[in-house]
Amino acid sequence: ATKLTEEKYELKEGQTLDVKCDYTLEKFASSQKAWQIIRDGEMPKTLACTERPSKNSHPVQVGRIILEDYHDHGLLRVRMVNLQVEDSGLYQCVIYQPPKEPHMLFDRIRLVVTKGFSGTPGSNENSTQNVYKIPPTTTKALCPLYTSPRTVTQAPPKSTADVSTPDSEINLTNVTDIIRVPVFN
């Protein structure tokens, strides 16, 4: 049986979480992929997703989350920049494969963000706040609103993308701004 495992990352406010999710190249290269948060007792919430079909090495940014899908490496790179204490939680990468259930990629990430920073003199601990401004050409994919295949009431929408501008940042601390996607039980 596949055992769900977690990998813990302890970071300070202002720093960047940078993880890579490994997937089967031949199977999932162009599949839509998503970054989700799992809160206790709740369904996973999708915070950001790639376009559909997923584009190779094409950054998709939703607020402080940047997704890059490297098809030729079978890797989804996820960065959460300028971390806030409120970002602490359990996260996972998934691959959408309708009408089947999303495919979860190992490992889940247990993010712990604490106040302040423990830098060495001269280290650019908070540089990510400046480095990762949203470029005007970065696309922001709309994530599909899937319901459980056992109770499907609507088909997943066709791929839609709009242009993200520097002032369109989503604040992850405001849960009303999170793209909410019910995923399967």
Epitope: E10, L17, K20, D22, L25, G74, D107, T128
Partner: antibody, heavy 119, light 108 residues
Framework: EVQLLESGGGLVQPGGSLRLSCAAS????????MSWVRQAPGKGLEWVST????????YYADSVKGRFTISRDNSKNTLDLQMNSLRAEDTAVYYC????????????WGQGTLVTVSS | EIVMTQSPATLSVSPGERATLSCRAS??????LAWYQQKPGQAPRLLIY???TRATGIPDRFSGSGSGTEFTLTISSLQSEDFAVYYC??????????FGQGTKVEIK
């Protein structure tokens, strides 16, 4: 408990071949990339090769490209390294290492197997 | 390819003292850095990853800091079992992921 056990090391002449194996247990083998890292006597660590969990993606250090082939059998939980056209500078302890689930660092290591290339 | 440079090559410290090891990357790697400990005749062991996070079972006297190009591994109070060689390794993206040349921590 994660366990990695290498085998197949030994003495081989320059230009010869050798196949290293690593038997893995204690984790969901096909969910993780695996690597070979080597260490020449008295020297530092040198990354050699990595293979993705499904086996669909492989990476090699320039020093071994075209001579070494990494492969895995997910049904048997084994990782292999086929080494051809061996050179004296390939002499090292070869470690099998499990790649972490979130990034390309190594969270578990085998005990290593010594490969000596000498005439 | 990113070059990782560790300093000093050898660090002589008395038991109970603090040890500070440095690792520098030739280009920014954000916090994509791991530290390993290797004792003679043994395989390396993961200490720190993501520049700051201690691996499972690693005592809290080991701590990592830094980001970008400059990183530090600090051992707050050296125990006899801490005398070993320490390596840093970058993992900014896919391989090759390079190691530093190592710092040997020896008894003063």
């Amino acid at each position: 408990e994660v366990q990695l056990l290498e085998s197949g090391g030994g003495l081989v002449q320059p230009g010869g071949s050798l196949r290293l194996s690593c038997a893995a247990s204690g984790f969901t083998f096909n969910a993780y990339a695996m690597s070979w890292v080597r260490q020449a006597p008295g020297k530092g660590l040198e990354w050699v090769s990595t293979i993705s969990g499904s086996g669909s993606t492989t990476y090699y250090a320039d020093s071994v490209k075209g001579r070494f082939t990494i492969s895995r059998d997910n049904s048997k939980n084994t990782l292999d390294l086929q080494m051809n056209s061996l050179r004296a500078e390939d002499t090292a302890v070869y470690y099998c290492a499990k790649v972490a689930g979130s990034n390309f660092f190594f969270d578990h290591w085998g005990q290593g197997t010594l490969v000596t290339v000498s005439s | 390819e990113i070059v990782m440079t560790q300093s000093p090559a050898t660090l002589s410290v008395s038991p109970g003292e603090r040890a500070t090891l440095s690792c520098r990357a030739s280009q920014s790697i954000n916090a994509n850095l791991a530290w390993y400990q290797q004792k003679p005749g043994q395989a390396p062991r993961l200490l720190i990853y993501g520049a700051y996070t201690r691996a499972t079972g690693i005592p809290d006297r080991f701590s990592g800091s830094g980001s970008g190009t400059e990183f530090t591994l600090t051992i707050s109070s050296l125990q006899s079992e801490d005398f070993a060689v320490y390596y840093c390794q970058e993992f900014i993206l896919f391989p090759p992921n390079t190691f530093g040349q190592g710092t040997k921590v020896e008894i003063k």
